[in-house]
């Protein structure tokens, strides 16, 4: 039986070109994590093993950082990179825990002062 | 290479109490949960349970709950079996056997095997 | 907790001949589904793991198949170095048990 619950940071925002971290924390459950993947929608875009350690999907390695911990940095935010993320934790002997994340990135303050105070 | 190497064969009067060893090398110990699979005289596999490396935790199938002990001592990479006020029926090979961790877990390494037997 | 039903419990075939064992499951493991073989006197080794991956270093006459919450280990041409049991495992909850075994002998 699964006992365990994921933790997640919610529903969470930050500017555009700015960075976020996204994390998960797994509790109530002796289960062994033995591997997480990160992904957005049906992309992935870093898993964690425990004994090979990082590997960040090609696709994604000039935006995506390792950690903290089994979290994961996403640097040079886009209003694309909006949506939902999921968090995989692989657990012995439990199988699979899943965690969700919203996250809106919003027009910077500063690029909506540029936008509206252009020199013609 | 990965290898499990357990200890010697035991022999045991009833109400005694036995501690096999199970010593890992080739790779990182905390890394890979470790399991214990008994084998009776003439009789099938059956697992014990196992410990989280990561943690220390144990967790104990149905008929092992009573007098039988999961251990680590990561110093010297070594899992350990305790079994106590030991009985003629717990007379078996007892296996040390490491989880890959692959996403679709399987018993990839086992130990030699501990034959303990319990006579009086 | 969730059952395994392993048939045949033993089997005598010739040497060339295909071997078929199946496990069954009482509810859905989705692959989570191992085999392992046992030479006497030694400690098992894997043979197929997640229903129908062939572990590194097993021959390929080794296979196995899904079907719902049955499971098949198939020897498509039994060799002498068979002689064994074979024994699957659930490994996609607590407790990761094993079916009852079978033992293939050489006629």
């Known amino acids: 039986m699964m006992t365990g619950t994921i933790e997640t940071t919610g529903n969470i925002s930050a500017e555009k070109g700015g960075s976020i971290i996204l994390q998960c924390h797994l509790s109530s459950t002796t289960a062994q994590v033995t591997q997480v993947n990160w992904e957005q929608q049906d992309q992935l875009l870093a898993i964690c093993n425990a004994d090979l350690g990082w590997h960040i999907s090609p696709s994604f390695k000039d935006r995506v950082a390792p950690g903290p911990g089994l979290g994961l940095t996403l640097q040079s935010l886009t209003v694309n990179d909006t949506g939902e993320y999921f968090c995989i934790y692989h657990t012995y002997p439990d199988g699979t825990y899943t965690g969700r994340i919203f996250l809106e990135v919003l027009e910077s303050s500063v690029a909506e002062h540029g936008a509206r105070f252009q020199i013609p | 290479q990965v290898q499990l190497v357990q200890s010697g064969s035991e022999l045991k009067k009833p109400g005694a109490s036995v501690k096999v060893s199970c010593k890992a090398s080739?790779?990182?110990?905390?890394?890979?949960?470790m399991n214990w699979v008994r084998q009776a005289p003439g009789r099938g596999l059956e697992w014990m349970g196992w410990i989280n490396t990561n943690t220390g935790s144990p967790a104990y199938a149905q008929d092992f709950t009573e007098r039988f002990v999961f251990s680590l001592d990561t110093s010297v990479t070594t899992a350990y079996l305790q079994i106590s006020s030991l009985k003629a029926e717990d007379t078996a090979v007892y296996y040390c056997?490491?989880?890959?961790?692959?996403?679709?877990?399987?018993?990839?390494?086992w130990g030699q095997g501990t034959l303990v037997t319990v006579s009086s | 907790d969730i059952q395994l039903t392993q048939s045949p419990s033993f089997l005598s075939a010739s040497v060339g001949d295909r071997v078929t064992i199946t496990c069954r499951a009482s509810?859905?493991?989705?692959?989570?589904l191992a085999w392992y073989q046992q030479k006497p006197g030694k400690a098992p080794r894997v043979l197929i793991y997640?229903?129908?991956t062939l572990q590194s270093g097993v021959p390929s006459r080794f296979s196995g198949s899904e079907s719902g919450t049955e499971f098949t280990l198939t020897i498509s041409s039994l060799q002498p170095e068979d002689l064994a049991t074979y024994y699957c495992q659930k490994l996609n909850s607590h407790p990761c048990s094993f079916g009852q075994g079978t033992k293939v002998e050489i006629k």
């Open positions: 509810q859905g493991i989705s692959s989570y």
């Open positions: 080739g790779y990182t110990l905390t890394n890979y949960p």
């Open positions: 056997a490491r989880t890959a961790i692959t996403s679709v877990y399987h018993f990839d390494y």
């Open positions: 997640g229903a129908t």
